[in-house]
Interface confidence: low
Amino acid sequence: GRGGDGGEPSQLPHCPSVSPSAQPWTHPGQSQLFADLSREELTAVMRFLTQRLGPGLVDAAQARPSDNCVFSVELQLPPKAAALAHLDRGSPPPAREALAIVFFGRQPQPNVSELVVGPLPHPSYMRDVTVERHGGPLPYHRRPVLFQEYLDIDQMIFNRELPQASGLLHHCCFYKHRGRNLVTMTTAPRGLQSGDRATWFGLYYNISGAGFFLHHVGLELLVNHKALDPARWTIQKVFYQGRYYDSLAQLEAQFEAGLVNVVLIPDNGTGGSWSLKSPVPPGPAPPLQFYPQGPRFSVQGSRVASSLWTFSFGLGAFSGPRIFDVRFQGERLVYEISLQEALAIYGGNSPAAMTTRYVDGGFGMGKYTTPLTRGVDCPYLATYVDWHFLLESQAPKTIRDAFCVFEQNQGLPLRRHHSDLYSHYFGGLAETVLVVRSMSTLLNYDYVWDTVFHPSGAIEIRFYATGYISSAFLFGATGKYGNQVSEHTLGTVHTHSAHFKVDLDVAGLENWVWAEDMVFVPMAVPWSPEHQLQRLQVTRKLLEMEEQAAFLVGSATPRYLYLASNHSNKWGHPRGYRIQMLSFAGEPLPQNSSMARGFSWERYQLAVTQRKEEEPSSSSVFNQNDPWAPTVDFSDFINNETIAGKDLVAWVTAGFLHIPHAEDIPNTVTVGNGVGFFLRPYNFFDEDPSFYSADSIYFRGDQDAGACEVNPLACLPQAAACAPDLPAFSHGGFSHN
């Protein structure tokens, strides 16, 4: 047999842990251009702001609404023209700058300002860009909610308000002193019209070590926290197990009078299916991929290089993951691909559920990035990279292992052909992709953000939803709003969508948009005219104006839509890159909704506009708390300008409808819940570039496929005869905000 003699296995050497030195990739020296700010840079900016803004500045971690504080500091991306002048023409690099968001609460007219600070690492200037970017000062009510504000709301709820309904809460919900067996969860937006700051909070059992999100106790409180003095905050409305009350005191009075039908909700602790701790003992180790001759890519700072691809990666504090200066075989394809916004719109028969529209950029896809767990979130042997940030603090912090980069054998041929016709041969190529990944946990949901680089020159952007569903207390006729998923829990229907900015530069900056599709055209059969044939033809149309290239969700979109240059490939076709969407988005919020303009991008599955420096983002961190008067309204970008021969940006929406079901307990699975898009070469090359891959396999029927010199796979028993050098498991830890 092939199993050896049953004795001790021979000691295999460890596989190399670093790349072989003689690799064709290089790291251009511009990695700093798009790199997120370092700890040192963040510290320098904070020191400078503290000097310039004076002694009235309070640490945002302790700031009250009536204080001045620095909310955030992050990289101010350089202007594209200056960046390209540096990257392509050797001009000096543009000044490295930071963007700070500052809350000015301690002044007669509180507002929010955006300040650009530079040059880094030694700042000497501060420029207030609020008016030029937003047309006026940013109203104070639009500011995101600080951790301290949530703490103050909890203080108010648990110390001042809940004791007013202690009888009912003791009866229904095992009420302990000041309710600390309960936790609150915010919803958003916060009110019904511009200027409001009134948030529905749901109350849940505080289940340690498991998802409280599934344990709603049926109580929801509308907290008006617009006043600058927390002592003046009020409960505007109370909702309990299907009915509305004006106050907790009124609810308690009605309970005492026997007028409240109370459902006793068990506090089942962590033992149920909502726990993520498996009841099954560990089994055999699952499959593991390794690099037999060391990784075939390298990561230096924010820049990644492989034999095919180079790019920079980063994370916007609010907008989330982004990549820049993507080059395939040395040629730039993409200046920027960046997540812009994520949105979840809920339905239900409780006020929290029916009003929830989470505009996640208002919380922050970067801010709520989590450490990646080796071997679960990414392959065990991936390369892990930290992220430094300065958010709601006076000092920088670090999320360990915030990104992972890995090469992965997909277990699928990229292309293959087995020939038995006329001649005998096999040719193919195992698809190996390069992946950069990060993940954000926004309250209950976890999002996986993937950028996948394929050897064919294609780039795939995909996001997956997992984590806990958001739930509501089960009462009344719930069939319209989801499915029952446990004894007292309704899994509430919702949509997920994400918006991406895709700044393709296809063989240069000047691009055109082409739409191609198919049509059946009837014709008489030439050799038998009495018969008719439906002949399949290609339709081609040049889209010249922004309005023509703005496709609403649910509308017919050309099956082939690509950006092309005026340069041709060898066969005379414009060199192009196709945008192929993979999305099954739900219905967008109707346009007559007063808040739809706050995420108007949701209406468009794809829109192509002229790239403008003053239209850097399709959303804003401020849109969540004032979607009725949005700081950025994406639909303003589509103003029927020409898109012929211009620097273009494609804006792509991907999403899906989720009707939660029993199998979403304990967590939603990523399977079937991943959407996104591909950027695929379309006549960009003269043939498939993977034709030149060193991983290609080819042998003829008259060759010995088991010979190492004929077939590289035959060399594996020697070339891959090493044991992977597995680092000890470590975890990036947990934040304690």
Epitope: G135, S194, G195, N592, S594, E614, A629
Partner: antibody
Framework: EVQILETGGGLVKPGGSLRLSCATS????????MNWVRQAPGKGLEWVAQ??????????YYGESLEGRVTISRDDSKSNVYLQVNSLRPEDTAIYYC???????????WGPGTMVTVSS | DIQMTQSPASLSASLEEIVTITCQAS??????LAWYQQKPGKSPQLLIY???TLADGVPSRFSGSRSGTQFSLKISRLQVEDIGIYYC?????????FGGGTNLELK
């Protein structure tokens, strides 16, 4: 102190043309959108035209009643805005106000206006 | 285009009286609404924007409210200097349109 002053009004024959000017001071002109709004004698207000700032590529927008006969322009170096009106008709008789837009959409400061009379 | 219907067209009121003027939008405009005051022989002045926010320097006796597509301007205690014509304006989408105006006179 924000100041806006319109000039260039007067009596014009039907079919004639007119160029109105608006001089501003007391604020950072480059940051704002500028508008023309008119008011016929004894009547209400009617928005005529808007020009956005450099950050918005000096995009221009026009109301329907004058569209095709009117051009708005600006000179950031002089903090001036202009309105060229062609093929004037008697119904174009009105006070023409120059105004500034804050928050992109509201007219927060207005000039005193300049009277345009179209009559033979 | 969005039509703005203002009522009443004219109104006589006494000093210290409460005065309410309404404006109806032909479609949903969110909070994108402003109120202007025009005194005889003068140019208009911004009073309220975003439906409810007082412009700088406007007395607190002026207030704005919204109910769906209907908007109201309220003067809590009428003063002599409040006499003039009041206009609403929608700022939801171009072309920006004004109501026909309400002429407020002293009784």
């Amino acid at each position: 102190e924000v100041q806006i002053l319109e000039t260039g009004g007067g009596l014009v024959k039907p079919g004639g043309s007119l160029r109105l000017s608006c001089a501003t001071s007391g604020f950072n002109f480059n940051d704002y959108f500028m508008n023309w709004v008119r008011q016929a004698p004894g009547k209400g207000l009617e928005w005529v035209a808007q020009i956005r700032n450099k950050h918005y590529n000096y995009a221009t927008y026009y109301g329907e009643s004058l569209e095709g006969r009117v051009t708005i322009s600006r000179d950031d170096s002089k903090s001036n805005v202009y309105l060229q009106v062609n093929s004037l008709r008697p119904e174009d008789t009105a006070i023409y106000y120059c105004s500034r837009s804050s928050y992109l959409r509201y007219f927060d400061f207005w000039g005193p206006g300049t009277m345009v009379t179209v009559s033979s | 285009d969005i039509q703005m219907t203002q009522s009443p067209a004219s109104l006589s009121a006494s000093l210290e009286e409460i005065v309410t003027i309404t404006c109806q939008a032909s479609q949903d405009i969110g909070n994108w609404l402003a109120w202007y005051q025009q005194k005889p022989g003068k140019s208009p002045q911004l009073l309220i924007y975003d439906a409810t926010t007082l412009a700088d320097g406007v007395p607190s006796r002026f207030s704005g409210s919204r109910s769906g597509t209907q908007f109201s301007l309220k003067i809590s205690r009428l003063q002599v200097e409040d006499i003039g014509i009041y206009y609403c304006q929608q700022a939801s989408s171009a072309p920006w349109t004004f109501g026909g105006g309400t002429n407020l006179e002293l009784k």
